[in-house]
Interface confidence: medium
Amino acid sequence: ASVATELRCQCLQTLQGIHPKNIQSVNVKSPGPHCAQTEVIATLKNGRKACLNPASPIVKKIIEKMLNSDKSN
């Protein structure tokens, strides 16, 4: 069974390369009983979803930028 079906994680694997301009919003799900790992789920401008690697420096920058833009709105 995959990680997703073994726990209740939503991220089967993470997308390695993604350009920030393609991202509409980002949701960071903290670990919990449903899933032992932090999950970063991006909603893309085409409406699709993608899981990003929370340990990636680029992803960390994207999250920081998104959170800052949320605060300024």
């Epitope: 079906t5 073994e6 209740r8 939503q10 089967l12 919990g32 789920i41």
Partner: antibody, heavy 125, light 107 residues
Framework: EVQLLESGGGLVQPGGSLRLSCAAS????????MSWVRQAPGKGLEWVSA????????YYADAVKGRFTISRDNSKNTLYLQMNSLRAEDTAVYYC??????????????????WGQGTPVTVSS | DIQMTQSPSSLSASVGDRVTITCRAS??????LHWYQQKPGKAPKLLIY???NLESGVPSRFSGSGSGTDFTLTINSLQPEDFATYYC?????????FGQGTKLEIK
């Protein structure tokens, strides 16, 4: 055809036990999480329990924790709910539901997309 | 636990009407929300998954929107077969929780 068929419901006295079964067909049973959901007479839907595809992870509502046990036999394509120490408030129609994981690239989500017809459980003396 | 609150709890409408049902989560759940329809004596049926995606075979007069804590199910041009009870459900975390339901009745 994708199908779920519950059985095992009936009348039981308070403090008694019952085991519900849910026979699955038409899909790869071992790949998907499954849930039990109940509905008391005239009331709304209440999630009871869920189990992962392999059976290695289980989840329960607080109201049934310690009394109910969810399990599955993937070789028989069957889901179970063992209900012990039954109370009057457990009276309900019990549904099993498949948690279809809609898979987009790099993303998985859980929706109860196939339901059984339900089996009634009455706890009364 | 995440509480889901639906409003209204009941609603009367006529064939052809446009109706809106709302669902509010007690904390942010992103778009981890589904909508179900249930008719008397029948099992629930999935209508909308992940807040806004139409389940296969569901008529396009049904639509969903929202993210975070506030969600909406809209039915455009009500048909006789749409009179039923509607439930929202979050799967952001366990325990999974449903709204209390909205009963849609014929006026």
């Amino acid at each position: 055809e994708v199908q779920l068929l519950e059985s095992g419901g009936g009348l039981v006295q308070p403090g008694g036990s019952l085991r519900l079964s849910c026979a699955a067909s038409g899909f790869t049973f071992s790949e998907l999480s499954m849930s039990w959901v109940r509905q008391a007479p005239g009331k709304g839907l209440e999630w009871v329990s869920a189990i992962s595809g392999s059976g290695g992870s289980t989840y329960y509502a607080d109201a049934v924790k310690g009394r109910f046990t969810i399990s599955r036999d993937n070789s028989k394509n069957t889901l179970y709910l063992q209900m012990n120490s039954l109370r009057a408030e457990d009276t309900a129609v019990y549904y099993c539901a498949r948690e279809g994981g809609r898979l987009e690239p790099y993303y998985y989500y859980y929706a109860m997309d196939v339901w059984g017809q339900g089996t009634p459980v009455t706890v009364s003396s | 636990d995440i509480q889901m609150t639906q409003s209204p709890s009941s609603l009367s409408a006529s064939v052809g009407d446009r109706v809106t049902i709302t669902c509010r989560a007690s904390q942010s759940i992103s778009d981890n929300l589904h909508w179900y329809q249930q008719k008397p004596g029948k099992a629930p049926k999935l209508l909308i998954y992940d807040a806004s995606n139409l389940e296969s075979g569901v008529p396009s007069r049904f639509s969903g929107s929202g993210s975070g804590t506030d969600f909406t199910l809209t039915i455009n041009s009500l048909q006789p077969e749409d009179f039923a009870t509607y439930y929202c459900q979050q799967y952001y975390s366990t325990p999974l929780t449903f709204g209390q339901g909205t009963k849609l009745e014929i006026k």
